[in-house]
């Protein structure tokens, strides 16, 4: 066949007319929109046929394919057919109308389609977007055919800007028919159970009307067999789980099972498996470790937590100094338990606005009828330094002493220093660390006491100042864990009137 | 022959308490969902609640939930509708129906049993 | 909850009329809808599944049609044995009934 002009895409003046001629060693035809326009068919002497479509009065709604084909029934093979595609650029029609049926686009599986929407222009620029939606997609188009890419179930539509109008094309509407995409999901009512207990597994698969399920566990391969049970579910349609339930499970029925799903229609399938464990007895064990010394801050809150794993779900308790601890209806103790997986636990102890009394000796003790475990630590609260009392002394002896007295847990450190110079310390000059130093400038006693029942240490520091001889800022300073407090005096010499 | 028989209906004062049976015959029970649909006097149809085959999932609709217990044994062929805390709201013909396997719309109809409440 | 609004609640039409019932889902409930036809006094028969499929042994004058949440049942030419209420029923997710729609003859 030979197509003149050869094409295979051209581009004609809307409202002129166009020749199209098509050549070959059997009668030839022309055809648009699986019709044959009107048209001049001949044979030449020489034995070639002819035919040639006159194109008149030329609109934007003769932009598509035409194709010359053989015209006999001799059903002669696909390639006997030339393909020319004309564009008609007219600014009259936007987008070229397409049959009520082109406009639903329906799937029975994921695959590339096509959303035919067609322009009059091969310059024009077109852009697809969700019915709903401004944001233009990336999907490549094609003006010849529209544009093609895997779809979601949605509603699409096409636009275009001609001259300074923007025009959208009709609504397509892409459904996709849940046939037979099997997705098959297992679980079981516990994956740890104890010697005699019972293992029920489920599996569950939706959507499909025809399904056989087939279960893979420890116990067949030693040729035991297990008949599941199917249910339909009644919560939606085609919701079938199979039951797979062995009683009285043997340590060897621990293992990998799983369910595969076949549906006969397309012969999909799909398969998953699950891991149960059969214990000869229940179990608790601690995971993780909790230091034996624990801290809190007094007036603040604290959570102390223990992590553990149990089979059966264990009795959880907590003591202080031996006594069983519950939930206070004050609100300053709050316990909790929590099951984060089938067989870990999260058992909390919140004290909440920490008292000096709360500190003692905790023991968290998870028990059932198998197993048990207990742990146990020192709770110690931490009270920051605070400097109670700073004086100075002027004793006969013609020294001058400095004493300060502080408390805080744990017990406190404490720093004198000294600041010569008033008017640039201790702003623009560090002050001098005091302390037993070699020279015979200051002399410090300290005294540390426990009181047991405010639980906090107390210290006692004395300062001796051999020689004052000007103005001296004397700071005493309290450090621990927890904080910081600083008192400071100024200590004058003898000779001077304060 | 699908067969669904249903007895067990009667006149109960509000708050007492009724069980219903239905004997299933002509099918293979156990393979099988069922339900309970009642007719209020000159109204329409309303689901209660269904069972699947295996007796393993219960569905109510929310106006039964707490008060209605479906349930089945099937040994015996048949369907139960336990229903305390009843009210004069409740009554009404109850028919047992099938679900069919898969699809779960009903199939088959029993031809009920009347159901009054009233002091 | 899906509710399913039947209309009308009641018509009259003469033998050999066309007869057609509506019924809209609040949601869509993707074809998964019957109709049965319920005689007084009796149990109701199942007539179409799955929007259009018949039942075996019922005539074929009965048929439906729809998609997402629009239903219609439709007699082709009424009958006086087809003198009944007639239901629809949602399956999608869990079951709701129509009012029911009652057909008279002229």
């Known amino acids: 066949l030979v197509v003149t002009p050869p094409g295979p895409e051209l581009v004609l003046n809307v409202s002129s007319t166009f020749v199209l001629t098509c050549s070959g060693s059997a009668p030839v035809v022309w055809e648009r929109m699986s019709q044959e326009p009107p048209q001049e068919m001949a044979k030449a002497q020489d034995g070639t046929f002819s035919s040639v479509l006159t194109l008149t009065n030329l609109t934007g709604l003769d932009t598509g394919e035409y194709f010359c084909t053989h015209n006999d029934s001799r059903g002669l093979e696909t390639d006997e057919r030339k393909r020319l595609y004309i564009f008609v650029p007219d600014p009259t029609v936007g987008f070229l109308p397409n049959d009520a049926e082109e406009l639903f686009i329906f799937l029975t599986e994921i695959t590339e389609i096509t959303i035919p929407c067609r322009v009059t222009d091969p310059q024009l620029v077109v852009t697809l977007h969700e019915k709903k939606g401004d944001v233009a997609l990336p999907v490549p188009y094609d003006h010849q055919r529209g544009f093609s890419g895997i779809f979601e179930d949605r509603s699409y539509i096409c636009k275009t800007t001609i001259g300074d109008r923007e025009v959208d094309s009709d609504a397509y509407y892409v459904y996709r028919l849940q046939v037979s995409s099997i997705n098959v999901s297992v679980n079981a009512v516990q994956t740890v159970v104890r010697q005699g207990e019972n293992i029920t597994l489920m599996c569950i698969v939706i959507g499909n009307e025809v399904v056989n399920f087939e279960w893979t566990y420890p116990r067949k391969e030693s040729g035991r067999l297990v008949e599941p049970v199917t249910d339909f579910l009644l919560d939606m349609p085609y919701h079938i789980r199979s039951i797979l339930h062995i009683p009285s499970a043997e340590l060897e029925d621990s293992g990998t099972y799983t369910c595969n799903v076949t549906e006969s229609v397309n012969d999909h399938q799909d398969e998953k498996a699950i891991n149960i464990t059969v214990v000869e007895s229940g179990y608790v064990r601690l995971l993780g470790e909790v230091g034996t010394l624990q801290f809190a801050e007094l007036h603040r809150s604290r959570t102390l937590q223990v992590v553990f794993e149990a089979y059966p779900p264990p009795t959880v308790l907590w003591f202080k100094d031996n006594r069983t601890l519950g939930d206070s209806s004050a609100g300053e103790i709050a316990l909790s338990t929590r099951n984060v997986s089938e067989t870990r636990y999260v058992s909390e102890l919140t004290l909440v606005r920490v008292k000096v009394a709360e500190a003692g000796h905790y023991t968290m003790r998870a028990f059932h009828e198998d197993a048990e475990v207990q742990l146990s630590f020192q709770l110690q609260i931490n009270v920051p330094v605070r400097v109670l009392e700073l004086s100075e002394s002027h004793p006969d002896s013609g020294e001058q002493t400095v004493r300060c007295r502080g408390r805080g847990m744990p017990q406190p450190n404490i720093i004198w220093s000294a600041c010569r110079d008033l008017k640039r310390c201790p702003r623009e000059l560090p002050p001098t660390l005091l302390g037993n130093s070699s020279e015979e400038e200051s002399q410090l006693e300290t005294n540390v006491t426990y009181w047991e029942e405010e639980q906090e240490f107390e210290v006692v520091s004395t300062l001796r100042l051999q020689h004052v001889d000007r103005p001296l800022s004397v700071r005493c300073t309290l450090r621990n864990a927890v904080g910081q407090d600083t008192q400071e005096v100024i200590v004058v010499p003898h000779s001077l009137p304060f | 022959e699908v067969q669904l028989v249903e007895s067990g209906g009667g006149l109960v004062q509000p708050g007492g308490s009724l069980r219903l049976s239905c004997a299933a015959s002509?099918?293979?029970?156990?393979?099988?969902?069922m339900a309970w649909v009642r007719q209020a006097p000159g109204k329409g149809l309303e689901w209660v609640a269904s069972?699947?085959?295996?007796?393993?999932?219960?569905y109510y609709r929310d106006s039964v939930k707490g008060r209605f217990t479906i349930s089945r044994d099937n040994a015996k062929n048949s369907l139960y509708l336990q229903m305390n805390s009843l009210r004069a709201e409740d009554t009404a013909v109850y028919y047992c129906a099938r679900h069919t396997p898969g699809a779960n719309y009903f199939d088959y109809w029993g031809q009920g049993t009347m159901v009054t409440v009233s002091s | 909850d899906i509710q399913m609004t039947q209309s009308p609640s009641s018509l009259s039409a003469s033998v050999g009329d066309r007869v057609t019932i509506t019924c809209q889902a609040s949601q869509s409930i993707k074809n998964y809808i019957a109709w049965y036809q319920q005689k007084p006094g009796k149990a109701p028969r199942l007539l179409i599944r799955y929007t259009s499929t018949l039942e075996s042994g019922v005539p074929s004058r009965f048929s439906g049609s729809g998609s997402g949440r629009d239903y219609t049942f439709t007699i082709s030419s009424l009958q006086p044995e087809d003198i009944a209420t007639y239901y629809c029923?949602?399956?999608?997710?869990?079951?709701?009934f129509g009012g029911g729609t009652k057909v008279e003859i002229k």
């Open positions: 029923v949602q399956y999608a997710n869990l079951y709701t």
């Open positions: 069972i699947t085959n295996s007796g393993g999932n219960t």
């Open positions: 002509g099918f293979t029970f156990s393979n099988y969902g």
